[in-house]
Each structure stands twice: as structure tokens, then as C-alpha cells.
Interface confidence: low
């Protein structure tokens, strides 16, 4: 396999390339629909209640045929709309040009309205961060799109959870879709403007507030549900901002809008690095140190209730999901790969295809175990045992399953559990699970994980090839399952 496999998907490359697929491919399986829980206020009396997403529980058989019918129905009902199923989200730079990207250019958002829907999905883009003048200068040279709006395209195609195609997005295809590009490099936490002293503005938290303010004039004021979603740094941004958005809407006179969060690949651990390195750049700097420095540099803000739990100067704790989550008031659904590539990157784990030493194998397995532990009290969670990064705006986000349930279905169940008829009930809905965390102990032990490609040959690898390539000894992997290595290989090869 040439110089070996590099399955590590650096966020910087992922976002630099502009593609959301990176170097992963996704196996298409019989598509499975939507899901999720926690409690919220019922709509005000007299308000029309928008129907919930289709409940696919009864649809056992041919999902493709069912989806084709749904799409055909949707298309036949759509011609009266000027949008004509146009997938594009259109760029709107903020009218308040003082709320800016790092370089002082106005921040903005991409919007695709769905006039019949009272659901709004606001998605926060990810893409690492920078935390001092030196690495921000470097970022500006190499990833300007993540620091400036000057070269943003006029439109973007909505993919995954941002898609308006029911077969690609069985969860919320009919929602109003908003994509907020990440151009503040501050994990959506900053509140400082560009000045003589500050070469860069860091206004992530203010950008979210301003986008919400402007969307109120574009129909958000009539929303029933606002789902603040995000991937990677955007996922952490959700945890940092969801309560503030709810508070903002309350203060502006819209207390009936139910604000929820969906944090994808933003639930990081402040664990011990596999190999400690000095805080030289964004990738090698230990997350705690990077965030500690970043907060000061960005004038970063964290959720008030979390901040009060920590000493001054210790606000960095609130960037870590398992610490901030218990302080949040809004319901949040957490999506996290158990073996997240960004987590491994900051932990200085680089998988090159050389045989993995036992120490590293144990480290990786322990990471999955720790991650799983932090999710045990998160009622709404989806954590497959895969080595990957980000999922919700990938086109094939419907493919991965945990315990037989796909992410869109889990989100649908979550919606149902938050609906007013269940708000007093703490028991999960029958046949509609929302706490879905893989229990198998090693990367890609879940056969629905996205397929890995060899970085050098471009060839797909099945799970067995991948594990052997990573240096996992099949005997070690098979033993805890009570299987012979040959049996396990057969099962994995068949995708069972």
C-alpha cells in the first residue's frame, strides 16, 4: 500500500478543500430515516402546530421506493413555489457591517427559505482556530476563506442535514436552511473587534447574535423551532452559544421559539496527549493550552452558567462538552465519533499505516472508552465507533447506524420526545431510541462506519483491511468478542 495509510483527516485540509467529503467515501445502504429527547414548552394556544417529520416506524420494506414517492409528492406540491426545488442557499452579508470576519470584512450567512415551514436550521461551519498573531497570520495566508468573506461564492449547495431533498435529508428537508460560514477563527466565542491594537477581529459569538437578529426580519420571528447545529469547531460553537441564542430571542420578545442544539464532532476531551508537544502551532498545541490562550486573544465568551462554575481564568473548561453540557438549559443532541480524527490530531496520534504499537492501540481504545463515559448522562446522543470527523452535512449522513438506528431517525425520535405530549415523560419512546452510543471497543468495529481510502492508492479498504493496516492484531480484536480471527474477518468483510 505504498507509504501506508493516512486516515487522519485534518480539519484544515477538509475545510481548505471546501469539500465536505474529504478523503472518506460512504457506503450507501438501504436508507433509514429520522429521530430524539428532553423537555420544552408547548406552542402557545391558538398557534398552528406544524406537523412533525414523517414517522417511518411502519416503513419496513423498500425505503428507496418510499422516498421516491415522498419526493414525487413533494415535487408535485412545489410548482406554486418560486423556489422550484432549487437546492442553493444564497449569500447575505450582514447589514450591520461592524460585525466582521477576522480581516474586517462583513460576516454573513447563506439562506434558503422554506415559506411553509416554521422550522429553522442554523448551521455553524467548523475549521479549527488560531490563537496568536503568528498562527493567525499563517492561517490568513493559507486559509483565507476561514478569515474573510471577500471571496465567498454567492451561493452554496445544501448537503446532508442542510439538503432540501427528502431522500438526502429525511429529518428536516422542509426547514428553512441557514449556513453560517466560519470566518472568526475563535470557535464561535469571540467578542472583540479589529482595532489599531488588534490586527484581527474575533467576533464569532457576535456574528451568531447578529445573524439571528437579521433573520428575525426574514421570517425567523414566526419560527416554532430553531435548531442551532454545527460541526467540529462549529459543534463546540453550538455548546457555547445555544443558551445565549435562546436568551437573545427571549429578550427580543420571542420566548415561544424553542431553541435546541445539535453539536456534531465538537465534543472534545481535555485528555492527556499521546505524546506531549510544546504549544507551537494550532495542531500540536494541547487543547487546554490552545483554548486558554485563545480566550484571552479572542476576548472569548462562554455560557454564563458554566462560567460561574469555574474560577476566573479557568473559562477554558467551558469549551469541553462534558463540562459545559450539564450547565445548559436548551436541549442539545450530541453527535460524536468515538475515535474522532480531530481529537486524535490534538492528542498527537498520527496513523501512518505503520504497525501500531500496543501502547498506541491501548491509547486509542481508551480514548473511545473515555468518550463513551462522558456521554453516559447525555440522553440525546449518537456516537458510532468510527475513525472519522464530522457527519451532519455529508450527503450520506443517513448511512451510519448505531444499534440499527440511523442519525436522522435518532433526531426524529428526539423531536418527538421534545414534543409537548411527551414533555412530562422521562421514559424514552418505544422503538424510538435517542441515546445511541456504540459499545464495541475499537475503530470501525461498527460495520456501517464510513469507508476509509488509502491516501496514496485511493483504494477503498474494508474494515478488516483497515484494522490490519493500522496494526491491530486480529487475535486481540477477536478474542473479547469470543470469536476466532478468521470468523471475525469473515464477518467484517461481509459488513455484518
Amino acid at each position: 500500500m505504498g507509504r501506508g495509510v493516512r486516515v487522519l483527516l485534518l480539519l484544515s485540509l477538509l475545510h481548505c478543500a471546501g469539500g465536505s467529503e474529504g478523503r472518506k467515501t460512504w457506503r450507501r445502504r438501504g436508507q433509514q430515516p429520522p429521530p430524539p429527547p428532553r423537555t420544552e414548552a408547548a406552542p402557545a394556544a391558538g398557534q398552528p402546530v406544524e406537523s412533525f417529520p414523517l414517522d417511518f416506524t411502519a416503513v419496513e420494506g423498500n425505503m428507496d421506493s418510499f422516498m421516491a414517492q415522498v419526493k414525487s409528492l413533494a415535487q408535485s406540491l412545489y410548482p406554486c413555489s418560486a423556489q422550484q426545488l432549487n437546492e442553493d442557499l444564497r449569500l447575505h452579508l450582514l447589514l450591520n457591517t461592524s460585525v466582521t470576519c477576522n480581516d474586517g470584512s462583513p460576516a454573513g450567512y447563506y439562506l434558503k427559505e422554506s415559506r411553509g415551514s416554521r422550522r429553522w436550521l442554523l448551521f455553524l461551519e467548523g475549521g479549527w482556530y488560531c490563537f496568536n498573531r503568528e498562527n493567525c497570520d499563517s492561517r490568513y495566508d493559507t486559509m483565507r476563506r476561514l478569515m474573510s468573506s471577500r471571496d465567498w461564492p454567492r451561493t452554496r449547495t445544501g448537503t446532508g442535514i442542510l439538503s432540501s431533498q427528502p431522500e438526502e435529508n429525511p429529518y428536516w428537508w422542509n426547514a428553512n436552511m441557514v449556513f453560517i460560514p466560519y470566518c472568526s477563527s475563535d470557535v464561535w466565542s469571540g467578542a472583540s473587534s479589529k482595532s489599531e491594537k488588534n490586527e484581527y477581529a474575533f467576533m464569532g459569538a457576535l456574528i451568531i447574535q447578529e445573524v439571528v437578529r437579521e433573520l428575525l426580519g426574514r421570517g425567523l420571528s414566526g419560527a416554532k423551532v430553531l435548531l442551532l447545529a454545527g460541526s467540529s469547531a462549529g459543534g463546540t460553537g453550538v455548546l457555547l452559544n445555544v443558551d445565549r441564542v435562546a436568551e437573545q430571542l427571549e429578550k427580543l420578545g420571542y420566548p415561544a421559539i424553542q431553541v435546541r442544539g445539535l453539536a456534531d464532532s465538537g465534543w472534545f476531551l481535555d485528555n492527556k496527549q499521546y505524546r506531549h508537544t510544546d504549544c507551537v502551532d494550532t495542531i500540536t498545541c494541547a487543547p487546554t493550552e490552545a483554548i486558554r490562550r485563545g480566550i484571552r486573544y479572542w476576548n472569548g465568551v462562554v455560557p454564563e452558567r458554566c462560567r460561574r462554575q469555574f474560577q476566573e481564568g479557568e473559562e477554558w473548561n467551558c469549551f469541553f462538552g462534558y463540562k459545559v453540557y450539564p450547565t445548559l438549559r436548551c436541549p442539545v443532541f450530541v453527535v460524536q465519533w468515538l475515535f474522532d480524527e480531530a481529537q486524535l490530531t490534538v492528542d498527537n496520534v498520527h496513523l501512518t499505516g505503520q504497525p501500531v504499537q500496543e501502547g498506541l492501540r491501548l491509547y486509542i481504545q481508551n480514548l473511545g472508552r473515555e468518550l463513551r463515559h462522558t456521554l453516559k448522562d447525555v440522553p440525546a446522543s449518537f456516537a458510532p465507533a468510527c475513525l472519522s470527523h464530522e457527519i451532519i452535512i455529508r450527503s450520506h449522513w443517513t448511512d451510519v447506524q448505531v444499534k440499527g438506528t440511523s442519525l436522522p431517525r435518532a433526531l426524529h425520535c428526539w423531536d418527538r420526545s421534545l414534543h409537548d405530549s411527551h414533555k412530562a415523560s422521562k421514559t424514552p419512546l418505544k422503538g424510538c431510541p435517542v441515546h445511541l452510543v456504540d459499545s464495541c471497543p475499537w475503530p470501525h468495529c461498527n460495520p456501517s462506519c464510513p469507508t476509509v481510502r488509502d491516501q496514496f492508492t485511493g483504494q477503498e479498504m474494508n474494515v478488516a483491511q483497515f484494522l490490519m493496516h493500522m496494526g491491530f492484531d486480529m487475535q486481540t480484536v477477536a478474542q473479547p468478542q469470543g470469536l476466532e480471527p478468521s470468523e471475525l474477518l469473515g464477518m467484517l468483510s461481509n459488513g455484518s
Epitope: 461592524s98 467578542a191 472583540s192 473587534s193 482595532s195 491594537k197 476576548n299 454564563e304 481564568g313
Partner: antibody, heavy 121, light 109 residues
Framework: EVKLVESGGGLVKPGGSLKLSCAAS????????MSWVRQTPEKRLEWVAT????????YYSDSVKGRFTISRNNARNTLYLQMSSLRSEDTALYYC??????????????WGQGTSVTVSS | QAVVTQESALTTSPGETVTLTCRSS?????????ANWVQEKPDHLFTGLIG???YRAPGVPARFSGSLIGDKAALTITGAQTEDEAIYFC?????????FGGGTKLTVL
């Protein structure tokens, strides 16, 4: 009721030193940033210094940097301003003010009644 | 050092709406300048009214509101009352220091 009471002002010669105190009551002192602000004889307000709630971070105006030191004793609910190398332009009424945090927009909501400092030979 | 400029004096009548503004020499005032508005009444009685551009301090009457108007911070008194006659100072935060404006003397006739 929130109360801030400054003390320690007086007449001092140029180059001299003075230590101002501000006794706080009626709120959780250790949860708030605190500032010193002065009002010049011409009635202009000038911000002097701010200290963070735990005392870890201090900010000073350029005009006093290196000469004044802001500090606090959270156990005693007291804010201090140690002034040295005083100049005639430091003559002013000195106020301590309570600040909200970022979520309150750093609002300087409560002010003391002021203590007078005169620097003159 | 940045300079913060306010109207030196304004006059209004009881029940009228009046707006005071606060300009920065460095350019447009944004929310991250955390514009503060402080009221001074006779006998050196200072009260903070507004922080963070539009956050009204507890106990401050609802007729006082803060906002951004164009490139300036603004304090609006909707339905001014005679007791609102005072000097109003604005302060802007420049990342590591506050700068106060010269104050606006508001007369309510």
C-alpha cells in the same frame, strides 16, 4: 443595598504616594470586576484602572501605567488603588465603580461617592 | 489614544424623546466596544444606566435604552422626565482600556 465607600484621599506633594480604599457591601464582591474612575477639576471622567473579579487581570490607562497599582482583598470586600510618583494632573475626585461581566456588557452600574486627591506643592 | 466624542449639550421637553450619541475617533462603534452610559446628577452622584451597547442595568427605568445608530453608540430617553436632567457620559472599551466621552449636559425644560 449595594454600597461603595471610598477613603484615603487627601493633599499630597508631587512625587508622593497615597493609597485609596473602597469598601464594598450589599453584593457578592468576589463575583465582580471593579474599576477606579476619576473626575478631573474640569469635570471630565477618566478611567484609571480595572481589576478582574479574582484579581488575576489588571488593566491600566496609559497615563497611570507603572505608577498606580490596583488590587483587591475579596475576603475583606475591599478594593485598593496604590498611587505613587503622583503628578499635579492626578488631581481629581476618585471613584470606585462596580462592573458587570461581559454578559452585562461590563456595565459600570454602581459608583461610590468619591474621595478627593489633590497633588500640589 | 482614541477620542470619544459626545454632544456637549442638548435640550428637550418633558415627554419628548431625545437621543444622545457617542462617536469613536477610530471608526464605527460596534457591539464589542461595550458602550456604557453613565448618568451624573448634582453632588457627584453617578449611576450606570447601560452596558454592552443595549443592556439596561437593573433598576434603570425602561425609558432609557441603548443602541447603535449608524457608526455611533446611542442613548435614547423615550418620554424624558424632569428628573432626567443630568450629565450623561458614554464610555467605550478598546480591548484593554476604557475611554470616556466629554459628557452631554441634558436639560429638560
Amino acid at each position: 443595598e449595594v454600597k461603595l465607600v471610598e477613603s484615603g484621599g487627601g493633599l499630597v506633594k508631587p512625587g508622593g504616594s497615597l493609597k485609596l480604599s473602597c469598601a464594598a457591601s450589599g453584593f457578592v464582591f468576589s463575583s465582580h470586576d471593579m474599576s477606579w474612575v476619576r473626575q478631573t477639576p474640569e469635570k471630565r471622567l477618566e478611567w484609571v484602572a480595572t481589576i478582574s473579579s479574582g484579581g488575576s487581570y489588571n488593566y491600566y490607562s496609559d497615563s497611570v501605567k507603572g505608577r498606580f497599582t490596583i488590587s483587591r482583598n475579596n475576603a475583606r470586600n475591599t478594593l485598593y488603588l496604590q498611587m505613587s510618583s503622583l503628578r499635579s494632573e492626578d488631581t481629581a475626585l476618585y471613584y470606585c465603580a462596580r462592573q458587570g461581566d461581559r454578559y452585562d456588557g461590563y456595565v459600570m452600574d454602581y459608583w461610590g461617592q468619591g474621595t478627593s486627591v489633590t497633588v500640589s506643592s | 489614544q482614541a477620542v470619544v466624542t459626545q454632544e456637549s449639550a442638548l435640550t428637550t421637553s418633558p415627554g419628548e424623546t431625545v437621543t444622545l450619541t457617542c462617536r469613536s475617533s477610530t471608526g464605527a462603534v460596534t457591539t464589542s466596544y461595550y458602550a456604557n452610559w453613565v448618568q451624573e446628577k448634582p453632588d457627584h452622584l453617578f449611576t450606570g444606566l447601560i452596558g454592552g451597547t443595549n443592556y439596561r442595568a437593573p433598576g434603570v427605568p425602561a425609558r432609557f435604552s441603548g443602541s447603535l445608530i449608524g457608526d455611533k453608540a446611542a442613548l435614547t430617553i423615550t418620554g424624558a422626565q424632569t428628573e432626567d436632567e443630568a450629565i450623561y457620559f458614554c464610555a467605550l472599551w478598546y480591548n484593554n482600556h476604557w475611554v470616556f466621552g466629554g459628557g452631554t449636559k441634558l436639560t429638560v425644560l
